[in-house]
């Protein structure tokens, strides 16, 4: 019986909802990959619960996750990156729930960084550039980026532009004059790998110049 919960505890445990979700990050620390899982119900009592991944691993049967507050985490080089792994929530030796997951389909890229906006007076446009660590990676190199911008006063009125490069041009006439704008960017895998949007980059703020052309008109957003 060692390693098992008390019978009463297990009966209670089986009434709970142990649904969980996971995401992988490849080459997140040099050649190391990571896998992060968390329960969907924030009220689950995680005291005796562990996560284990088995299958689709290099020269080991299974790996145990480390618990970091509410999340469970593995950092390893031992993902085969093909086929499905069995990820289980366990109490001692008993599996409460398991999911078969292909780690290449739950990839969450790292957030873009170094977002900046430069105004070109002669061209009457704004050049948006940003960087991504994925340009240097072996695996998740091809990403789709989502650039979102809004006038600071428009709380939820974001305009989104999808692009595959790390450079975008915004025409001045498409923006309101003499306005403060907030812009941010995120990424998602776009070739071979599948998964989720990254976190947003830190926002960048820029001001559009006042109108000084003869017509005094600018196109609305």
């Amino acid at each position: 019986e060692s390693g098992y919960a008390q019978n009463g505890d297990l009966e209670d445990a089986e009434l709970d909802d142990y649904s969980f979700s996971c995401y992988s990050q490849l080459e997140v620390n040099g050649s190391q990959h990571s896998l992060t899982c968390a329960f969907e119900d924030p009220d689950v009592n995680i005291t005796n619960l562990e996560f284990e991944i088995c299958g689709a691993l290099v020269e080991v049967k299974c790996l145990n996750f480390r618990k970091l507050q509410e999340i469970y985490f593995i950092e390893t080089k031992k993902f085969l990156l093909i086929g499905k792994s069995n990820i289980c929530v366990k109490v001692g030796e008993k599996s409460l729930t398991c999911k078969k997951i292909d780690l290449t389909t739950i990839v969450k890229p790292e957030a873009p960084f170094d977002l900046s906006v430069v105004y070109r007076e002669g061209a009457n446009d704004f050049v948006v550039t940003f960087n991504t660590s994925h340009l240097q990676k072996k695996y998740v190199k091809v990403l789709m980026h989502d650039v979102a911008y809004r006038q600071e006063k428009d709380e939820n009125k974001w305009t989104h532009v999808n692009l595959s490069s790390t450079k975008l041009t915004l025409l001045q006439r498409k923006l309101q004059p003499a306005a403060m704008y907030e812009i941010k960017v995120r990424s998602i895998p776009d070739h071979y790998f599948k998964g989720f949007w990254s976190e947003w980059s830190p926002s960048y703020y820029f001001r559009t110049p006042e109108i000084n052309n003869s017509s005094g008109e600018m196109d609305p957003i």
Epitope: C54, E59, K61, G83
Partner: antibody, heavy 119, light 105 residues
């Protein structure tokens, strides 16, 4: 149809190396693992290792680690198994076999390559 | 490393009879697969993940079991079923059992 065609029989001396090829056709080569399994005369099956053709990542049976090297050439959809420092007990039929990564079983096998190690 | 022990080593039966082949693991296994091999041929998959029939395999073959004990059943032997059968664990190092030979009585 899905097919794995292996190179022909080999006769080697003890201490030598052998390299067996396995040409895949009829499916996306990089979408499945390639396993290598051997069978000594009158004996059972022994898993040697596998390669993920997409990225070249390998996983070896500890029994063969250091003696077996798995590689692939995705441009010609071919996997290779090289076994070094051959001994007489390496005499066997060597199979390449496609691995279904959804269920981790071997669903398509090559015809086998007989390797004889004899002085 | 898990050891898979198949029993019996040889099973002597007549066509039409029921064959029950056993595979016992030295510690718990999540999934088990079964293969058939005829003399001079490569193995072919029969059952994967304990009980799922591989492509083209007739319904007289079935698999069951959990934990450490798994069974392959052939409900009514046909002449082409006389062969050697191997079980294999789903996870590294993908160990095979020693095999059970089903021969004509």
């Amino acid at each position: 149809q899905v097919q794995l065609v292996q190179s022909g029989a080999e006769v080697k001396k003890p201490g030598a190396s052998v390299k067996v090829s396995c040409k895949a056709s009829g499916y996306t080569f990089t979408g499945y693992t390639m396993n290598w399994v051997r069978q000594a005369p009158g004996q059972g099956l022994e898993w040697m290792g596998l390669i993920n053709p997409y990225n070249g990542v390998t996983s070896y049976n500890q029994k063969f680690k250091g003696r077996v090297t798995l590689t692939r050439d995705t441009s010609i959809s071919t996997a290779y198994m090289e076994l070094s420092r051959l001994r007489s007990d390496d005499t066997a039929v060597y199979y390449c076999a496609r691995g279904d990564g959804n269920y981790w079983y071997v669903d398509v096998w090559g015809q086998g390559t007989t390797v004889t190690v004899s002085s | 490393e898990i050891v898979l022990t198949q029993s019996p080593a040889t099973l002597s039966l007549s066509p039409g009879e029921r064959a029950t082949l056993s595979c016992s693991a030295s510690s718990s296994v999540t999934y088990m697969h079964w293969y058939q091999q005829k003399p001079g041929q490569a193995p072919r998959p029969l059952i994967y993940e304990i009980s799922k029939l591989a492509s083209g395999i007739p319904a007289r073959f079935s698999g069951s079991g959990s934990g450490t004990d798994f069974t392959l059943t052939i409900s009514s032997l046909e002449p082409e079923d006389f062969a050697v059968y191997y079980c294999q664990e789903w996870n590294y190092p993908y160990t095979f059992g020693g095999g059970t030979k089903v021969e004509i009585k």
